[in-house]
Amino acid sequence: LQDPCSNCPAGTFCDNNRNQICSPCPPNSFSSAGGQRTCDICRQCKGVFRTRKECSSTSNAECDCTPGFHCLGAGCSMCEQDCKQGQELTKKGCKDCCFGTFNDQKRGICRPWTNCSLDGKSVLVNGTKERDVVCGPSPADLSPGASSVTPPAPAREPGHSPQ
């Protein structure tokens, strides 16, 4: 025998208390597929969350984060504070990237500058807290007359110009 609940479309639930009729989902609840025996409570985007898409009888609400925060986790399950470029979020708040590291986004951690010498290249542009170094041609490519690129002054590798 076919389950009578299988006839209940999205936006309804199979109400066992009422002879398995397909009752519409009550306000603030939804069912995104047919044959459901309950409707799920709509997600509420409160506090640091804001509503990106309203709930309906057939689909849950979707949240994103208020300005100054960004989403983390599946379906934006958490909001994390933004930092400035050149910073990372620690337990004590936003902190500048340590020397030799950078962050070019408002989220995430500071990452080490690229070590150009590992690829046999030289530093073309020094790194900053906000930007990675730019590696240039290898020193062997810089034989006299072979290139118009002026090699950087010998500095620590990777290089960092004083802020």
Epitope: C8, P9, R18, P26, P27
Partner: antibody
Framework: EVQLVESGGGLVQPGGSLRLSCAAS?????????PCWVRQAPGKGLEWIGC?????????YDANWTKGRFTISRDNSKNTVYLQMNSLRAEDTAVYYC?????????????WGQGTLVTVSS | DIQMTQSPSSLSASVGDRVTITCQAS??????LAWYQQKPGKAPKLLIY???TLASGVPSRFSGSGSGTDFTLTISSLQPEDFATYYC???????????FGTGTKVTVK
């Protein structure tokens, strides 16, 4: 403009049939918006006739007194809902309203047509 | 079947009065109740849904309360445009689940 417009009312003899139409404009019936029929006899209160699921399924919700005489149907391509009334009696004389029952308004009737008068008399 | 009983069936009041109308369901309908206002020759207008939520554009002098079987519509300070008939309706969907109350006519004292 968001509105419901009923048509098809008029004078009909006892035992006769009539089909009322309700055309929706400015929105589409969906799982969030169910079309319903309500009637009001002269000088009397509101009486719920029934509703139909607004999406593609043909689930209907009806007042028990309508069974076998009144049938609600829908044509999604025309965004129109119908009330087929058979075996009409003098006591079916009333203004028939089409209403939109909305999930967003706790399934209350948040939009109503102007009504169409049905008179059953010989 | 769900039956909805309203009281009183009619009342006379003056502008500025506080008016209370009650509605009783024959079985529990949680908070699934709507209130409407209807003026002669016009379609009903939704005032309150989910027992206590004010519909869009409805003045704040209207309020609703209750849950289960007993519900109340209150007009805190009656205005000239509020003289009308008021209906409750169960929105507890299902066959015979959306019955209207018997109506309350509010007239000038």
């Amino acid at each position: 403009e968001v509105q419901l417009v009923e048509s098809g009312g008029g004078l009909v003899q006892p035992g006769g049939s009539l089909r009322l139409s309700c055309a929706a404009s400015g929105f589409s019936f969906s799982a969030n918006y169910y079309p319903c029929w309500v009637r009001q006899a002269p000088g009397k209160g509101l009486e719920w006739i029934g509703c139909i699921y607004g999406g593609s399924s043909d689930i209907t919700y009806d007042a028990n007194w309508t069974k076998g005489r009144f049938t609600i149907s829908r044509d999604n391509s025309k965004n129109t809902v119908y009330l087929q009334m058979n075996s009409l009696r003098a006591e079916d004389t009333a203004v028939y309203y089409c209403a939109r029952s909305a999930w967003y308004s706790g399934w209350g009737g948040d939009l109503w047509g102007q009504g169409t008068l049905v008179t059953v008399s010989s | 079947d769900i039956q909805m009983t309203q009281s009183p069936s009619s009342l006379s009041a003056s502008v500025g009065d506080r008016v209370t109308i009650t509605c009783q369901a024959s079985q529990s309908i949680s908070n699934r109740l709507a209130w409407y206002q209807q003026k002669p020759g016009k379609a009903p207008k939704l005032l309150i849904y989910s027992a206590s939520t004010l519909a869009s554009g409805v003045p704040s002098r209207f309020s609703g309360s209750g849950s289960g079987t007993d519900f109340t519509l209150t007009i805190s300070s009656l205005q000239p445009e509020d003289f009308a008939t008021y209906y409750c309706q169960s929105t507890y969907y299902g066959n015979d689940g959306n019955a209207f109350g018997t109506g309350t006519k509010v007239t000038v004292k």
